[in-house]
Amino acid sequence: DGCKDIFMKNEILSASQPFAFNCTFPPITSGEVSVTWYKNSSKIPVSKIIQSRIHQDETWILFLPMEWGDSGVYQCVIKGRDSCHRIHVNLTVFEKHWCDTSIGGLPNLSDEYKQILHLGKDDSLTCHLHFPKSCVLGPIKWYKDCNEIKGERFTVLETRLLVSNVSAEDRGNYACQAILTHSGKQYEVLNGITVSITERAGYGGSVPKIIYPKNHSIEVQLGTTLIVDCNVTDTKDNTNLRCWRVNNTLVDDYYDESKRIREGVETHVSFREHNLYTVNITFLEVKMEDYGLPFMCHAGVSTAYIILQLPAPDFR
């Protein structure tokens, strides 16, 4: 059929909860392409009816929820004007209850379910929740050894759990939990994460570089909505936290009640030698009190700020 076959690594997944996989393969999917999902070399495409338990949602295949019998090889066919690629994804579903004491029953989990914290440093764990826009995710709760995590050393920030002054006791089995809503139905997502510790600096103590902002002011009208990206390059092994602060406080905490100013979800693009991270700050409505205040983007030891200022009056 003239399609080039591409084989992705195996995905090992937990039964009885939602799962989604996005058929993206840059640069193939960057242009005008059509994407169709199939299961086990079937000629019949996966349903696009949103009421179906398994259906295609734009470029995604979505399982609501995943079940034991869903294991198998799924193919997504990406057709461009002059090209065709068939991406094979091997999904293995296992039955795992994260509070089981018998951790020996765990399969060889994929890398995002194995994370490393750096001793003595401020570090973070990430709850990997990859779902299409049609899925709305609620706030994330974090657990260690089946107990909800509380304490001043721990801060939940979007999809991350920030851990300050990591100690040896922080190693072990974690889980992050969120409620996913799709077409009015709610599902629980629970990701188990095995967390190990290391003393190694890993990235050789390199300093992240903030590409933008550059310690400058931005003219913005009172009452408008403003989104500013903080773009950071850093080494692949970095353990640096990236966040927005005002008055030395995380913006999400500082504006906890009004939620008028919020930090966005961090994204990154991976290059051969480094990662480019983006985390934005959103002002839903700029108020007078925001002017002249430095909003700081932090990335490890690096900082850069923006200051909002009123546009100069136009006397014409």
Partner: antibody, heavy 120, light 106 residues
Framework: QVQLQESGPGLVKPSQTLSLTCTVS??????GYWNWIRNHPGKGLEYI?????????YYNPSLKSRVTISRDTSKNQYYLKLSSVTAADTAVYYC??????????????WGQGTLVTVSS | DIQMTQSPSSLSASVGDRVTITCRAS?????MYWYQQKPGKAPKLWIY???NLASGVPSRFSGSGSGTSYTLTISSLQPEDFATYYC?????????FGQGTKLEIK
């Protein structure tokens, strides 16, 4: 069960490059840290370096100008190259990894070691 | 570089003896790791995070210390304990081993 196995020539000529392979089973080299250590005859252990889960490499500064650690994730193997070898590089070379009790630095899993002799 | 100095370098002792091996670091280290090695074999992780015994290590072994001074103690020496013991630190690169302590039968 994690297993590591070193392989490569047991004899290397002076000034040439020593090349070793560590084949890993029971774990993915895209998680954790994958180390090389050597043991000089009648002497102690020397830490050579590691390649991490993301492909980042760290080398002992005493060997940095001569050592390269790389990997092939599709084969689940990682490699050691040591250039311009001399008799002082004669040693048993080990690959090892940690992760025991969730401690990456606790080097619990070791290969059996391979003796490399540098001689003309 | 952090220098790791083990003392003694070699030690002759008898079965049933209490034995202490010391590892001194030239700068503070957060944790110490100890390995046992027998001739012709790969090293084995023996003690990690200063005081935790690896799987299969008898309870007669213990580890302690902080800062620059760490010890491995055997409360009652057994025939299978005769080997070389190495300390190692991962706090500061380069990650260094001690020169080893060879424990021999008297």
């Amino acid at each position: 069960q994690v297993q590591l196995q070193e392989s490569g020539p047991g004899l290397v000529k002076p000034s040439q490059t020593l090349s070793l392979t560590c084949t890993v089973s029971g774990a993915s080299i895209t998680s954790g840290y994958w180390n090389w250590i050597r043991n000089h005859p009648g002497k102690g252990l020397e830490y050579i370096g590691y390649i991490s889960y993301s492909g980042y490499t760290y080398y002992n500064p005493s060997l940095k100008s001569r050592v390269t650690i790389s990997r092939d994730t599709s084969k689940n193997q990682y490699y050691l190259k040591l250039s311009s070898v001399t008799a002082a590089d004669t040693a048993v070379y080990y690959c090892a990894t940690g992760g025991y009790d969730y401690v990456e630095d606790a080097l619990y899993y070791w290969g059996q070691g391979t003796l490399v002799t540098v001689s003309s | 570089d952090i220098q790791m100095t083990q003392s003694p370098s070699s030690l002759s002792a008898s079965v049933g003896d209490r034995v202490t091996i010391t590892c001194r670091a030239s700068s503070n280290v957060r944790y110490m790791y100890w390995y046992q090695q027998k001739p012709g074999k790969a090293p084995k992780l023996w003690i990690y995070l200063t005081s935790n015994l690896a799987s299969g290590v008898p309870s007669r072994f213990s580890g302690s210390g902080s800062g620059t001074s760490y010890t491995l103690t055997i409360s009652s020496l057994q025939p299978e304990d005769f080997a070389t013991y190495y300390c190692q630190q991962f706090t500061t690169s380069p990650y260094t081993f001690g020169q080893g302590t060879k424990l021999e039968i008297k």
